[in-house]
Interface confidence: low
């Protein structure tokens, strides 16, 4: 348990998902949507779904991409159906306070996101909205 | 796909406890909040309260002062309680996973509240 | 948050349209679910977010609306579609469900 005053659920989006994890379900609601590709044993493993916590979700989205790994991250519905994570190419930095988004895929870094696929604060990461 | 099995005493007098159970299979028990709802007989639906993984709670103001809920994330399990039960609170008591909305459902328990 | 639900209960022929109202006592923006529940079953979600349809569920089922006033509409009812609907906000705590409206095929 914990001492802080419980929180209200957060609002979440409906993600595509796909791989081992997602059981039967072809969609998962979670606070973000991703869409990963990892190096396992030499073969390339994608998947997409949801990051239900939000504390997880934005520490795996603001992990760096690795020449192993890569995980895009966006919030809004559906909003992974057309990403396709790639692994870094030599000689491109990647801040790893930046999430990692392909310029020709039209997304931004969450510094800059706006619009269906803004970063929403704190405050508004609540799934009941007080006001 | 998440499934939910519920189970608990179906048959109370007035002054006891309702308990009731729910385990979570298929699922991360991360990924929902996890909720009671009740239904009387031929009535409509009423959310009780909800928990996450972490044991942060969120109860109906109508039953604040009765109901509790925790969770048995090792097992993968939520608890209902409910003391001092009446016969107004006779219903199905269902388990549910949920995130905007409530996905997934445990297959009910029906709840007699007599003397 | 109160939730309203209009009319309690209908009947129809099958391949009716049948439209079901819902009116919030505040303001909810689209934070509005729609649920189908079978006699003697648990309800089912089929749409979130007052107009999204839920995976896996018939195109005949659709839901408008945001503010306090929706509406949850059966294109061409068919008779699988026997039952009580409700609705239910999100929008804060606690959470409420509508009164319910139970459908039925007329003779």
């Known amino acids: 348990m914990e001492d802080e005053k419980p929180k209200v659920n957060p609002k979440l989006y409906m993600c595509v998902c796909e791989g081992l994890s997602c059981g039967n379900e072809d969609h998962c609601e979670g606070q973000q949507c991703f869409s990963s590709l990892s190096i396992n044993d030499g073969f390339h493993v994608y998947q997409k779904g949801c990051f239900q916590v939000y504390e997880q979700g934005k520490m795996t989205c603001k992990t760096p991409p690795s020449p192993g790994q890569a995980v895009e991250c966006c919030q809004g519905d559906w909003c992974n159906r057309n990403i396709t994570a790639q692994l870094p190419t030599k000689g491109k930095s990647f801040p790893g306070t930046q999430n990692f988004h392909l310029e020709e895929q039209k997304l931004i870094s969450e510094e800059d996101l706006g619009g269906e696929q803004k970063l929403i604060s704190e405050e508004d990461l609540h799934h009941h909205h007080h006001h | 796909q998440v499934q939910l099995q519920q189970w608990g005493a179906g048959l109370l007098k007035p002054s006891e406890t309702l308990s009731l159970t729910c385990a979570v299979y298929n699922g991360s028990f991360s990924s929902y909040y996890w909720s009671w709802i009740r239904q009387p007989p031929g009535k409509g639906l009423e959310w009780l309260g909800e928990?996450?993984?972490?044991?942060?709670?969120n109860y109906n103001p109508s039953l604040t002062s009765r109901v509790t809920i925790s969770v048995d994330t090792s097992k993968n399990q939520f608890s209902l309680k409910l003391p001092s039960v009446t016969a107004a609170d006779t219903a199905i008591y269902y388990c549910?996973?949920?995130?905007?909305?409530?996905?997934?459902w445990g297959q009910g328990t029906l709840v007699t509240v007599s003397s | 948050i109160q939730m309203t639900q209009s009319p309690s209960s209908l009947s129809a022929s099958v391949g009716d349209r049948v439209t079901i109202t819902c009116q919030a006592s505040?303001?909810?923006?689209?934070?509005l679910n729609w649920y189908q529940q079978k006699p003697g079953k648990a309800p089912k979600l089929l749409i979130y977010d007052a107009s999204n349809l839920v995976p896996g569920v018939p195109s005949r089922f659709s839901g408008t609306g945001s503010g306090t006033d929706f509406s949850f509409t059966i294109s061409s009812l068919q008779p699988e579609d026997i039952a009580t609907y409700y609705c239910?906000?999100?929008?804060?705590?606690?959470?409420?469900f509508g009164g319910g409206t139970t459908v039925a095929i007329s003779r």
């Open positions: 549910s996973a949920h995130t905007r909305g409530f996905l997934y």
């Open positions: 239910q906000h999100y929008y804060d705590l606690p959470l409420t």
């Open positions: 505040q303001d909810i923006n689209n934070y």
């Open positions: 928990i996450n993984h972490r044991g942060r709670t």
